[in-house]
């Protein structure tokens, strides 16, 4: 594949990454799959600067990111190390709350109305953000 040099239509470029902001809601797994089908991944927040950029674009709306602990440890979908990486949880979060009555705890992370993170039930239909890196090889064949 060829190296992607500019963002697809309707995607926003920022710091050598492209971002797509949904305007509808999906469960976390469906949002994750949507991004993968776009040769991207749910957004991985690696810095305060990136946090502010995403926050500016999503506004005060619950929005999924690419962070979950469905199999135990917290993991970013692109393999970025959670332990040493950037974190922006709300106070008292994550709490893996079981009191919602939906079964299980809270295994998927989202931006809250103030931008800070919360863990929530992965089935909730929140908006989402896809991200892809400009420097990574595209799956599309090169133009001849």
């Amino acid at each position: 594949g060829s190296e992607r040099t500019c963002c697809p239509v309707n995607w926003v470029e920022h710091e050598r990454s492209c971002y797509w902001f949904s305007r509808s809601g999906k469960a976390w797994a469906d949002a994750d799959n949507y991004c993968r089908l776009e040769d991207a991944h749910l957004v991985v927040v690696t810095s305060w600067e990136e946090q502010k950029f995403v926050q500016h674009h999503i506004g005060p709306v619950n929005t999924w990111m690419g962070l979950h602990d469905q199999n135990g440890p917290w993991k970013w979908v692109d393999g970025t190390d959670y332990e040493t990486g950037f974190k922006n949880w709300r106070p008292e979060q994550p709490d893996d709350w079981y009191g919602h009555g939906l079964g299980g705890g809270e295994d998927c992370a989202h931006f809250t109305d103030d931008g800070r993170w919360n863990d929530d039930v992965c089935q909730r239909p929140y908006r989402w953000v896809c991200e892809t890196e400009l420097d990574k090889a595209s799956q599309e064949p090169p133009l001849l």
Epitope: P73, W89, D96, Y98, G104, G105
Partner: antibody, heavy 115, light 107 residues
């Protein structure tokens, strides 16, 4: 590397108290629910208690409710289990474990309640 | 509270055998089920979470299936190191509860 090390077990008389500790390392402690699970001699596993990452939510098995208190000190990366009014049936190896799916366990500490 | 039952309580098998252990919940727990392996004198080891998701480092001869109330742990080809006691656990709601265990020993 994730490590969980329990301590504080020992022999105690019925009605007595004991405080177990679990020192955690190798991960972002405050991001995880922590649990205590016990296993009586020759018995199966019994979930005892859990606490949210920040410590604001606690959960207990009916068998220990009102007698045991789970807590944590995130500044010290340590989980605690205060056990009061101990009974013979509380005799067990007590394990500390990370998360609902128990992806990491300590090696356990033995609590013996006997006169 | 949700009660968990396991069958059989024990079984004898040989290396290379296919082994199936079943776990049943007293109410619907979706896929909030984990499986553990424990050897004498050792802490339990997590094998599977979310009913069928194999934990990192667990051999592929282990598999889990099921949803709702009925679940299965399958060992496709029993290895010498697989002789142990196996427990299921629901984490649908507190208090979490374990099954009574299934001991797999040498035939």
């Amino acid at each position: 590397e994730v490590q969980l090390l329990e301590s504080g077990g020992g022999l105690v008389q019925p009605g007595g108290s004991l405080r177990l500790s679990c020192a955690a390392s190798g991960f972002s402690f405050s991001s995880y629910v922590m649990s205590w699970v016990r296993q009586g001699p020759g018995k199966g596993l019994e979930w005892v208690s859990a606490i949210s990452g920040s410590g604001d939510r606690t959960y207990y098995a009916d068998s220990v409710k009102g007698r045991f208190t789970i807590s944590r000190d995130n500044s010290k990366n340590t989980l605690y289990l205060q056990m009061n009014s101990l009974r013979a049936e509380d005799t067990a190896v007590y394990y500390c474990a990370r998360t609902a799916t128990k992806d990491y366990w300590g090696q356990g500490t033995l609590v013996t309640v006997s006169s | 509270d949700i009660q968990m039952t396991q069958s059989p309580s024990s079984l004898s098998a040989s290396v290379g055998d296919r082994v199936t252990i079943t776990c049943r919940a007293s109410q619907v727990i979706s896929n909030y089920l984990a499986w553990f392996q424990q050897k004498p004198g050792k802490a339990p080891k997590s094998l599977i979470s979310a009913a069928s998701s194999l934990r990192s480092g667990v051999p592929s001869n282990f598999s889990g299936s099921g949803s709702g109330t009925d679940f299965t742990l399958t060992i496709s080809s029993l290895q010498p190191e697989d002789f142990a006691t196996y427990y299921c656990q629901q984490y649908h709601s507190y208090p979490f509860t374990f099954g009574p265990g299934t001991k797999v020993d040498f035939k």
